[in-house]
Interface confidence: medium
Amino acid sequence: ATKLTEEKYELKEGQTLDVKCDYTLEKFASSQKAWQIIRDGEMPKTLACTERPSKNSHPVQVGRIILEDYHDHGLLRVRMVNLQVEDSGLYQCVIYQPPKEPHMLFDRIRLVVTKGFSGTPGSNENSTQNVYKIPPTTTKALCPLYTSPRTVTQAPPKSTADVSTPDSEINLTNVTDIIRVPVFN
C-alpha cells in the first residue's frame, strides 16, 4: 500500500490557503475533481468539486472554497479564503473516475489555523483580498454521492474541523457526502 503522507500549513485567521494538487495530465485532465475533509474515523466529506467534465482554468466557488483546474499544467488549484480556526483539519484532493473509486492525489494537507492575523506564512494580505475578485461561476457542479472507503482504512490524527462559511450563501458546518455548488449571479 502507498504510504499516506501529510504536508502541513500553519496559517492565521483571515488568510488564504492556496495549494496545488498535481495529477497525470493525459489521464485526468477533464475528470471531475474534488476537495475533501477527513475527520477521525469517518468517510472523507466532499466540500467542493469541479464541473463534469472539468473545465480548464474555470473557477468554481463553494462558499469560501475556490477550485481551479489547470489542464495544461496538470494541476488543481485549491483556495480556502478567510480562514477560520474551525477550518483546521486534514484535507485531500481526489479525482472522480466512475465507476471506479475516487483516485486520491498525494499529499494530504494538514491545515492548522490559529487566531490573530499575520501576513505569514500563507498568502499575503493582498492576495487574500484579491481572491474575491474572481468572476463568479454561473454553473452548477454536482459532486458525486460516494466517497472511497479505502481512504479511511487507517484513521488519521483527530481533527475537529468544521468548515463554516459565515459570509456566503452556503454553510458547510454540517457537511454531507453530496454538496451542490450554488449559482452565483
Epitope: 503522507t5 501529510e6 504536508e7 502541513k8 500549513y9 500553519e10 488564504t16 492556496d18 495549494v19 496545488k20 494538487c21 498535481d22 489547470y70 499544467h73 494541476l75 488549484r77 485549491v78 484535507y91 485531500q92 484532493c93 492525489l105 498525494f106 499529499d107 494530504r108 494537507i109 505569514t120 506564512p121 500563507g122 498568502s123 499575503n124 492576495s127
Partner: antibody, heavy 125, light 107 residues
C-alpha cells in the same frame, strides 16, 4: 535541464531598494516553486519566501514580510525579489532556487533542487 | 517556526573517513528534509531529499536517514571534493528553515 540565471551584483545605499531577477531556461517554469534564499557573509542560509508563477501568490518568512515582494512573469519565465528599506545587515548573496511538489503542496518535495548562481547585494553608505 | 539544529558545527576528517552529520528538528517533520552541500563562493547543491532519497547525479557515498525529528547525513568514504559546508533544511511547513551548517575540513 533547467537553469536559473540571476541578475548581476548590486551596490546600494541604506534606505534604498534592490530588485534581483532570476530567469529560468529549459523545462517547466510556471508550476515550480521559486524560492529566494539569502546568505550573509560567513553565515548560513535563510529562506525569504517563494512563489508559484502560475498562481502569482507569494509566501514570505515573517522577518521579511514587511520589506520583501516576490513576483514572477510567466511570459519571460522570470522571478523577481525586491527588498526595500535596505540596511547594512542586508549585505548578502541572494539565491533563487527551484522546487517542485508532486502532491498538494506549495513547497518542494524534492527540496530546492536547482539553484541560481547567486547575486551579491552590498549595502553601504 | 520549526528550528533546525545541526551538529557538529565543524569537524576535521581525512580522505577515506566515514563522516556523520546530524540534524534535529524542533518538532516532527515526517521525512520532509533535504541536505545541501556548499563550497566557498558557490551556490548550494542538493544532495538528499525526502530524508533519504539521493538527488540525481549525486555519488552513492552520500546517504541520508531518519524521520520525525532526528536525521543523519553520512559520507561513507570522504573524498577530496567533499570538503565543504553541509546544510539540512525542512520543508514540512512554511517558513522553510535551514540548519546552521556543518563545515567539513581537512585534518
Amino acid at each position: 535541464q533547467v537553469q536559473l540565471v540571476q541578475s548581476g551584483a548590486e551596490v546600494k545605499k541604506p534606505g534604498s531598494s534592490v530588485k534581483v531577477s532570476c530567469k529560468a531556461s529549459g523545462g517547466t517554469f510556471s508550476i515550480y516553486v521559486i524560492s529566494w534564499v539569502r546568505q550573509a557573509p560567513g553565515q548560513g542560509l535563510e529562506w525569504m519566501g517563494g512563489i508559484i508563477p502560475l498562481f502569482g501568490t507569494a509566501n514570505y518568512a515573517q522577518q521579511f514580510q514587511d520589506r520583501v515582494t516576490i513576483t514572477a512573469d510567466e511570459s519571460t519565465r522570470t522571478a523577481y525579489m525586491e527588498l526595500n528599506s535596505l540596511k547594512s545587515e542586508d549585505t548578502a548573496v541572494y539565491y533563487c532556487a527551484r522546487g517542485h511538489g508532486p502532491g498538494s503542496s506549495h513547497y518542494s518535495y524534492y527540496g530546492l533542487d536547482v539553484w541560481g548562481q547567486g547575486t551579491t547585494v552590498t549595502v553601504s553608505s | 517556526d520549526i528550528q533546525m539544529t545541526q551538529s557538529p558545527t565543524s569537524l576535521s576528517a581525512s580522505v577515506g573517513d566515514r563522516v556523520t552529520i546530524t540534524c534535529r528538528a524542533s518538532q516532527g517533520i515526517s521525512s520532509w528534509l533535504a541536505w545541501y552541500q556548499q563550497k566557498p563562493g558557490k551556490a548550494p547543491k542538493s544532495l538528499i531529499y525526502a530524508a533519504s532519497s539521493l538527488q540525481s547525479g549525486v555519488p552513492s557515498r552520500f546517504s541520508g536517514s531518519g524521520s520525525g525529528t532526528d536525521f543523519t547525513l553520512t559520507i561513507s568514504s570522504l573524498q577530496p571534493e567533499d570538503f565543504a559546508t553541509y546544510y539540512c533544511q525542512q520543508y514540512n511547513s512554511y517558513p522553510l528553515t535551514f540548519g546552521g551548517g556543518t563545515k567539513v575540513e581537512i585534518k
